[in-house]
């Protein structure tokens, strides 16, 4: 069986601003279970944008259902863009671990950026 | 107070139909995966079928796959479970049960008995 | 098939631990469900593994490793006479099940 992959397909995404952006990922397996996360940034001070298990994320939606027992897409929208918004968004997998889930594979990442809101 | 209550339970005989509803309350339900599981007399809890938020994908446990139907309507937030060619091997309670994120149980409701008899 | 033992039995204070095995640790999410008589609706007392409701007490707990569940009564007390039921869902198959079921019975 093949490891599973994080297929971000877009590096990069434009927007502008009080938009909306739709950041896409793609699992290649279900296996091992365990929730999806999105974050904004890199490293130790990366800010987590949406939790598949839990948490209020009121700007983000995912664009799939994600209560389908098959599902593999974990693309989101994020609305009302501002500048601030602006980064790199890494889609990435974790494995189920006691007490903590424990990062198994992370997208390669998609940069948004944010033009003026055109007048 | 989040709430989940059975009906349409009852006594039918062997080849007949029957349609059982999950009233819920006090959460978004459209927000929610759901299951059927029923325990027969005696006997231990066995998963029937789920369906996801929107309705779109259900899924059954093979030996009711084909004469049972999950369906759900979010307008009414309500559950169903349509039950054909019932057999005296389906007598048992049912129950509707709220899904985790990754289709656990986390709320049950009180179940609804139901009898195939002769 | 998930298997349970059939009973347990334990004085109060005492911890109880129930083992179930037969999933495959990568694929399964083990869950365990109180049912204090036959036919009254069960009660979650663990999701996700080890994850417990709110409303339920932090003397059960819960932890998965390899193919086995366990769940953990530390200090059980009267009221914890039950029929315990572990629940898995594998996310190969889609489809959840269930163990026998596991008597506990507090002498």
């Known amino acids: 069986e093949d490891e599973l992959q994080v297929i971000q397909p877009e590096k990069s995404v434009s927007v502008a601003a009080g938009e909306s952006a739709t950041l896409r990922c793609a699992m290649t397996s279900l296996i091992p279970v365990g929730p999806i996360m999105w974050f904004r940034g890199a490293g130790a001070g990366r800010e987590l944008i949406y939790n598949q298990k839990e948490g209020h994320f009121p700007r983000v939606t995912t664009v799939s259902e994600l209560t389908k027992r098959n599902n593999l897409d974990f693309s989101i929208s994020i609305s009302n863009i501002t500048p601030a918004d602006a980064g790199t968004y890494y889609c990435v997998k974790f494995r189920k671990g006691s007490p903590d889930d424990v990062e198994f594979k992370s997208g390669a990442g998609t940069e948004l950026s944010v033009r003026a809101k055109p007048s | 107070d989040l709430q989940l209550v059975e009906s349409g339970g009852g006594v039918v005989r062997p080849g007949e139909s029957l349609r059982l509803s999950c009233a819920a309350s006090?959460?978004?339900?459209?927000?929610?995966?759901m299951s059927w599981v029923r325990q027969a007399p005696g006997k231990g809890l066995e998963w029937l079928a789920g369906?996801?938020?929107?309705?779109?994908?259900?899924y059954y446990i093979d030996s009711v796959k084909g004469r049972f139907t999950i369906s759900r309507d979010n307008s009414k937030n309500s559950l169903y479970l349509q039950m054909n060619s019932l057999t005296a091997e389906d007598t048992a309670v049912y129950y509707c049960?709220?899904?985790?994120?990754?289709?656990?149980?986390?709320?049950w409701g009180l179940g609804t008995l139901v009898t195939v008899s002769s | 098939a998930l298997t349970q033992p059939a009973s347990v039995s334990a004085n109060p204070g005492e911890t109880v631990k129930i083992i179930c095995s037969g999933g495959?640790?990568?694929?399964?999410?083990y869950g365990w469900y109180q049912q204090k008589s036959p036919g009254s609706a069960p009660v979650t007392v663990i999701?996700?593994?080890?994850k417990r409701p709110s409303d339920i007490p932090s003397r059960f707990s819960g932890s998965a490793s390899g193919s086995a569940a366990t769940l953990t009564i530390t200090g059980v007390r009267v009221e914890d006479e039950a029929v315990y039921f572990c629940?898995?869902?594998?996310?190969?198959?889609?489809?959840?099940?269930f163990g026998a079921g596991t008597t506990l019975t507090v002498l």
């Open positions: 369906i996801s938020a929107g309705g779109s994908d259900t």
């Open positions: 629940g898995a869902y594998d996310g190969r198959t889609y489809i959840n099940t």
């Open positions: 006090g959460f978004t339900f459209s927000s929610y995966a």
């Open positions: 049960a709220r899904e985790t994120w990754n289709h656990l149980f986390d709320y």
């Open positions: 495959d640790y990568y694929s399964t999410y």
């Open positions: 999701h996700s593994d080890d």
